[in-house]
């Protein structure tokens, strides 16, 4: 049903859903701090633009009695319960920030007449793609998929002279929320990734993964997995690995690779790490000082959600336009705004664009080095290191199928 919005007469409210079930196990206090820091910035920007208005956030907490798994498994109904609570209290703001679980976002989008914008730090799954009033501020699965297909097809780089058409995907069901949906997208038989590959098999058991590493009859040399180096080590240990195996480790929200004193462990030598290009350091920010790298990205997405709202509010107010309209609800896409850490670009469907970075381990220095970058906005790969010091033969990535010549 339609809920009246606290969103007019110079007073603009943001509804922030503080859900017990969340994409990342982040204390709600940290998210509150991020939102409040964002509000301070927005107020300053509006004031500088000569707009004398009030912007506040209302934090809506669920009671946590029923939906208390803490992860996303029981988030589907929690989101709807919170919406009901908002509806009963007639406390809907101009914008809804909050659901980070794919399940809850999908259900909330489905079961409500959304005449207001929804901003999510998460909602990684393909089922949240192409939603007209949903904006996602952390890289969704679709963006990962497009990179992988682009990289698989690339065959004209000094270090990658074969296009690939095969892959194993390791997915054992214990993944974090982001990894779960990334791998889910790769596994889906109707996804772009599956459509573009000739062969793809999902490995679900540790032993399956371990056996492939030295199996002469393997159907692909490439294995995609998601998680950090420790996750890989737990699985792979110090086992021998065939020389033409390439492991692609998807670890987008981890900037530990970009710490100066980091040395890559020996087990990372046959691994290419896909991560996001780090922004400027957030370590001096009050909300992120005590956060791990992953959680910093999550809190930052909340903060940027507030800044995005401020950006849109400023534009609409300067143009004398009404905020409680479908036009406003549909406007949070195809734009660039000033985020906390620099410009943030949203694509035509409201999903954040970013620069992904593919790292390799230099056999000379045992340090991580950038092999290439990928701009999700233009779906283009840019080689950086034309003569990488790889572990693979001739310092080139091997063919994806052993024994197959150049194509």
């Amino acid at each position: 049903s339609q809920v009246s919005q606290n969103c007019h007469n110079g007073s603009y409210e943001i509804s922030v859903l503080m859900m017990g079930n969340s994409a990342f196990a982040e204390p709600l206090k940290n998210l509150e701090d991020a939102v409040n820091e964002g509000l301070e910035i927005v107020r300053g920007r509006l004031q500088n633009a000569g707009l004398n208005v009030t912007v506040n956030a209302t934090f809506m907490y669920s009671d946590g009695l029923i939906h208390n798994s803490g992860d996303c498994r029981s988030s589907t109904c929690e989101g709807l319960d919170l919406l009901r609570k908002i509806s009963n209290a007639q406390r809907m703001g101009c914008v809804l920030i909050g659901p980070s679980c794919t399940y809850s976002t999908f259900q909330m989008y489905l079961d409500t007449e959304l005449s207001y914008p929804m901003i999510s730090a998460g909602s990684f799954g393909l089922s949240c793609d192409y939603k007209e009033t949903l904006t996602r501020l952390m890289s969704p699965a679709r963006k990962l998929m497009y990179f992988l297909v682009n990289f698989w097809k690339t065959n004209d780089l000094p270090f990658k002279t074969y296009s690939w058409s095969t892959s194993y995907v390791y997915k054992n069901g214990t993944e974090t929320e982001d990894c779960f949906w990334y791998l889910n997208a790769l596994e889906a038989s109707v996804s772009y990734f599956s459509h573009e590959l000739g062969f793809k098999v999902v490995l679900r058991q540790d032993k399956e993964f371990q056996d492939i590493l030295m199996d002469h009859n393997r159907k692909s040399n490439v294995i995609i997995m998601c998680g950090g180096p420790e996750f890989l080590y737990k699985l792979k240990g110090d086992r021998a690995v065939a020389e033409d195996i390439v492991i692609i480790l998807v670890d987008l929200f981890n900037d530990q690779y970009f710490e100066d004193n980091v040395t890559a462990p020996d087990y990372m030598k046959n691994v290419l790490v896909l991560t996001l290009s780090p922004g400027n350091s957030l370590l001096n920010s009050s909300f992120s000082r005590n956060l791990s790298p992953t959680k910093r990205d999550f809190a930052l997405a909340y903060l940027n959600g507030i800044l995005l709202f401020g950006h849109m509010l400023k534009i609409f107010l300067e143009n004398g336009e009404n905020i409680t309209t479908p036009k406003f609800a549909h406007a949070f896409r195809n734009l660039t705004f000033e985020g906390y850490d620099g410009p943030v670009t949203l694509d035509d469907w409201g999903d954040v664009d970013s620069t992904m970075v593919l790292l390799y381990t230099s056999v000379d220095t045992k340090k991580y080095k950038v092999l290439l970058t990928y701009d999700t906005h233009v779906n283009k790969t840019y080689p950086v290191d034309m003569s990488p010091t790889f572990t693979w033969k001739n310092s080139k990535l091997p063919n994806d199928i052993t024994g197959r010549g150049p194509q």
């Epitope: 970009f258 290009s277 840019y382 950086v384």
Partner: nanobody, 123 residues
């Protein structure tokens, strides 16, 4: 002796492309952070792109999406690929190197500079 030599400049039409090279001698590029700078007539020198020693490119907003940087350690050479060139890109382009204190950040200042190569964008 440490030396940086730029090449590849010239006259190009708006919308066109150029690839500049910066050849290093007397040191290994791989251990250094490298920056491309430019100075337009009557203006101050400005940073265009930096490549940290770890290989992370950092771009000025004015060239993002148009310019890309790469490094070939086997040739000890750095490249600046410039696409969709505009009249305002007209300048002398310099490459500079700095013994890196951080693998992932651009240095505040550079120790070694090349002589520059002129890029003119005009129809």
């Amino acid at each position: 002796e440490v030396q940086l030599v730029e090449s590849g400049g010239g006259l190009v039409q708006p919308g066109g492309s150029l690839r500049l090279s910066c050849a290093a001698s007397g040191f290994t590029l791989d251990d250094y952070a490298i920056g491309w700078f430019r100075q337009a007539p009557g203006k101050e020198r400005e940073g265009v792109i930096c490549l940290t020693s770890g290989g992370l490119p950092k771009y000025a907003d004015s060239v993002k999406g148009r310019f890309t940087i790469s490094r070939d350690n086997s040739k000890n050479t750095l490249y600046l690929q410039m696409n969709s060139l505009r009249a305002e890109d007209t300048a002398v382009y310099y490459c500079a190197a700095s013994g890196a204190t951080s693998r992932w950040n651009c240095p505040p200042q550079y120790d070694h500079w090349g002589q520059g190569t002129m890029v003119t964008v005009s129809s």
